[in-house]
């Protein structure tokens, strides 16, 4: 392009000019040959959506085995390929544990883990690299007022859903409360006055926010009333996505 | 940079070499100045996240006018060009359809569609490429208890807002429930006991989460009580943004 | 698992999370603000404390977030309200609670509601109550736009870093 530019501007160049043109042309060509691929690589490296292959968690596997974290090795359970291998992200869906507990499913239905994110019910969600993450959670609840009581309204119940972090560079100390939501429900008693259970009520407690996390920190959800969680499809989930 | 590089590697260059070096250096610099930005632009244009200008709602404008959405015209409503052409994103705001239905507006007020996202009330929101999307929805509801009834509280109503996907690679079969929120409201009857309508109640049912979507899949909202939707500004919306 | 309380834990207030240097990822404009717990009858947003921060151009001025560059942003906010039970002798009066994120822009002559939630709460007889409102969405914003909040029911806010917050990040 440089040669063409000079030719166009200066007309024919002869003698010593030819050598200069040759040098200029060769230099331009070499520069292009080097600059273009390097620029392509540089731009691709910097475009955040495109960060190359799957990044696996680089935490010390020995330490992991010692702690018995047993993080989920993503089986090829999902038919789809990981659509965005460069982006640490996770979406976990609520699953009932025995004994009225809240567990999380990482591979069924809409659930997934990408780019080195790991999950275990025992330890929570571990993010593979330092960064700014948008964390979110929604817990659906359901219940009925138990029988009895003279008032038309039953005893209130305050439902809380909270997101904590622990471990990693943050240290092994007290887990840190990151985000939480709450809702007080006052169930209606049996409207027919038959002293039976009241009608079913539903509510959802959700939230989301930015948190700066370090590699190896674990994020998990704690809730006040696991026995009232609604595990119907789409109702209860939590997740994280790296945004910076 | 070329000159410095040569100087550093080859020591001092004199006489005719200096001129050649000058030409080479200048050509190299000009070539870099032209090649690098052009390459950057070319690569950015080819990176799949970057698919060009604003795509407006593809719904039949005639049909829309028929529905008489009647949005408030803001001064200089949309002076902006598409601010980030490379990012598939959409924000749709609730609009009343005839017959107590919930429709969505894709271009007025704060609503927008970017980078090949398309919307029609009949088909929902179509995303232009495979990827990881954060989908969100908030539906505001309002109402009052109807007159009558001996109890101080009216009949409970459970409000649900649900996000589904259909079509695309997912197949033409049954739509798939992705995310859902619910809230049971038990309106208070006329406190003065005049058997009139109870006081207005308000609530919102919202959620958001990550979903891996494929190009051509459509996402849409379904709600339980379209007659109770609050269409005041900022109350009812849904959207999607590609995060990876 | 730790007990769930709506007050900041000692651990949380005693030690802040070390600030990150995100060498491996390009910083994007982002902000996460928390309600100032020392101001009980107003909602003042704070940055650079606890887990709150302003990053890559975001600034806080007159209790509003200033958008640093034009683009698409995800904007979110949450508040949590609480209150006491009413006395059995008193007539229960409904309480109106609302929280809104507003945009003030050179393009519009007024504050435009972006995110808005309302709730009528009827306090129960027996227990105190809690109610949270969270909302978030994507918006096309222009450099210099101001994002602010308006809240009804401020005396009922539960001001802690985990319950009352306001943020945005460029996509």
């Amino acid at each position: 392009m440089g040669a063409l530019g000079l030719e166009g501007r200066g007309g024919r160049l002869q003698g010593r000019g030819s050598l200069l043109l040759a040098v200029a042309g060769a230099t331009s060509l070499v520069t292009l040959l080097l600059a273009v691929p390097i620029t392509v690589l540089a731009v691709l490296a910097l475009v955040p959506q495109d960060q190359g292959g799957l990044v696996t968690d680089t935490a010390d596997p020995g330490a992991q085995a010692q702690q018995g974290l047993g993080f989920q090795k993503l089986p090829e359970e999902e038919p789809e390929a990981d659509l965005s291998p460069g982006l640490p992200a996770a979406h976990l869906i609520g699953a009932p544990l025995k004994g009225q507990g809240l567990g999380w499913e990482a591979t069924k239905e809409q659930a997934f883990l990408t780019s080195g994110t790991q999950f275990s019910d025992a330890e929570g969600l571990a993010l593979p690299q330092d960064g700014l993450y948008y964390l979110y959670c929604l817990v659906g609840y359901r219940g009925r007022a138990p029988p009895g009581g003279a008032e038309p309204r039953g005893r209130s119940v305050t439902l809380r859903s909270s997101l904590y972090r622990a471990g990693g560079a943050y240290g092994p100390g007290t887990p840190e409360l990151l985000l939480e939501g709450a809702e007080t429900v006052t169930p209606v008693l049996d409207p027919a006055g038959r002293q039976g259970y009241g009608p079913l009520w539903y509510t959802s407690v959700g939230f989301g926010g930015l948190v700066q996390l370090r590699r190896g920190e674990r994020v998990y959800v704690n809730i006040s009333h696991p026995d009232m969680v609604d595990f119907a499809r789409g109702k209860t989930f939590f997740g994280a996505v790296m945004v910076g | 940079m070329g000159a410095l590089g040569l100087e550093g590697r080859g020591g001092r260059l004199q006489g005719r070499g200096s001129l050649l070096l000058a030409v080479a250096g200048a050509t190299s610099l000009v070539t870099l100045l032209l090649a690098v930005p052009i390459t950057v632009l070319a690569v950015l244009a080819l990176v799949p996240q970057d698919q060009g200008g604003l795509v407006t709602d593809t719904a039949d404008p005639g049909a829309q006018a028929q529905q008489g959405l009647g949005f408030q015209k803001l001064p200089e409503e949309e002076p902006e060009a598409d601010l980030s052409p490379g990012l598939p994103a959409a924000h749709l705001i609730g609009a009343p359809l005839k017959g107590q239905g919930l429709g969505w507006e894709a271009t007025k007020e704060q609503a927008f569609l970017t980078s090949g996202t398309q919307f029609s009330d009949a088909e929902g929101l179509a995303l232009p490429q495979d990827g990881l999307y954060y989908l969100y929805c908030l539906v505001g509801y309002r109402g009052r208890a109807p007159p009558g009834g001996a109890e101080p509280r009216g009949r409970s109503v459970t409000l649900r807002s649900s996000l589904y996907r259909a079509g695309g690679a997912y197949g033409p079969g049954t739509p798939e429930l992705l995310l859902e929120g619910a809230e049971t409201v038990t309106p208070v009857l006329d406190p003065a006991g005049r058997q009139g309508y109870g006081p207005l109640w308000y609530t919102s049912v919202g959620f958001g989460g990550l979903v891996q979507l494929r190009r051509g899949e459509r996402v849409y909202v379904n709600i339980s009580h379209p007659d109770m939707v609050d269409f005041a500004r900022g109350k009812t919306f849904f959207g999607a943004v590609m995060v990876g | 698992l730790p007990g769930v309380g709506l007050t900041p834990s000692a651990a949380q207030t005693a030690r802040q999370h070390p600030k990150m240097h995100l060498a491996h990822s390009t910083l994007k404009p982002a902000a996460h603000l928390i309600g100032d717990p020392s101001k009980q009858n107003s909602l003042l947003w704070r940055a650079n404390t606890d887990r709150a921060f302003l990053q890559d151009g975001f600034s806080l001025s007159n209790n509003s977030l200033l958008v640093p560059t034009s683009g698409i942003y995800f904007v979110y906010s949450q508040v949590v309200f609480s209150g006491k039970a009413y006395s059995p002798k008193a007539t229960p009066t409904p309480l109106y609670l609302a929280h809104e994120v507003q945009l003030f822009s050179s393009q519009y002559p007024f504050h435009v509601p972006l995110l808005s939630s309302q709730k009528m709460v009827y306090p129960g007889l027996q227990e105190p109550w809690l109610h949270s409102m969270y909302h978030g969405a994507a918006f096309q914003l222009t450099q210099g736009d101001q994002l602010s909040t308006h809240t009804d029911g401020i005396p009922h806010l539960v001001l802690s870093p985990s319950t009352v917050f306001f943020g945005a990040f460029a996509l």
Epitope: A95, K98, S120 | - | -
Partner: antibody, heavy 118, light 111 residues
């Protein structure tokens, strides 16, 4: 992919103990889920015998309670069945399976045939 | 224990026709807003294979010819249209209460 494989003796004498091993690959048994033993009698009737949870807790079918023990070795990613005082009625095909909470038993071993006979 | 009663015990259906299998529980298997009822297909010499979870959700990789419905105590597995490959025994199973229990099975044959 997640795979389960049962192993153990195919023939056990009455009154002795039956010991079977389930080896799991592709997923850590301490990560999540419930790890079950199910048996199928010659007439094709299926019986859930019990499970060990990801956290190490157990649950056994009351009909077997005094005879059954399910344990695990996390380092080898294996879990085990021990059934004491076996009789001819304990003959059948023994399967190990992963119970994915409310998502059903999504992965099964191929099964191992056990005959109780002197 | 929750007893699951399957009917019919065997079923002969023509190719391309609909097969319907019923499962009745001795008590409700619903909890937390979902039904803890699952359906399996077992072919000779193979372990059972999960077809439907939570009463009506198709397991990944299972053809849409299989569908499930029902709640609380009454559940149905439907195969429509029946294909040659569907010859097998089908079992319902509940996981709402320990111990897990299975139905007695329904053997499907082609007419």
């Amino acid at each position: 992919d997640v795979q389960l494989q049962e192993s153990g003796p195919g023939l056990v004498k009455p009154s002795q103990s039956l010991s079977l091993t389930c080896s799991v690959t592709g997923y850590s048994i301490t990560s999540g889920y419930y790890w079950n033993w199910i048996r199928q009698f010659p007439g094709n009737k299926l019986e859930g015998m019990g499970y060990i949870s990801y956290d190490g807790s157990n649950n056994y079918n009351p009909s077997l309670k005094n005879r059954i023990s399910i344990t695990r070795d996390s380092s080898k990613n294996q879990f085990f069945l021990k059934l004491n005082s076996v009789t001819a009625e304990d003959s059948g095909t023994y399967y190990c399976a992963r119970d994915a909470y409310s998502y059903g038993m999504d992965y099964w071993g191929q099964g191992t045939s056990v005959t109780v006979s002197s | 224990d929750i007893v699951l009663t399957q009917s019919p015990a065997s079923l002969a259906v023509s190719l391309g026709q609909r097969a319907t299998i019923s499962c009745r529980a001795s008590e409700s298997v619903d909890n937390y807003g979902i039904s803890f009822m699952h359906w399996y297909q077992q072919k000779p010499g193979q372990p059972p294979k999960l077809l439907i979870y939570r009463a009506s959700n198709l397991e990944s990789g299972i053809p849409a010819r299989f569908s499930g419905s029902g709640s609380r105590t009454d559940f149905t597995l439907t195969i429509n249209p029946v294909e040659t490959d569907d010859v097998a025994t089908f079992y319902c199973q509940q996981s709402n209460k320990d111990p897990y229990t299975f139905g007695g099975g329904t053997k499907l044959e082609i007419k």
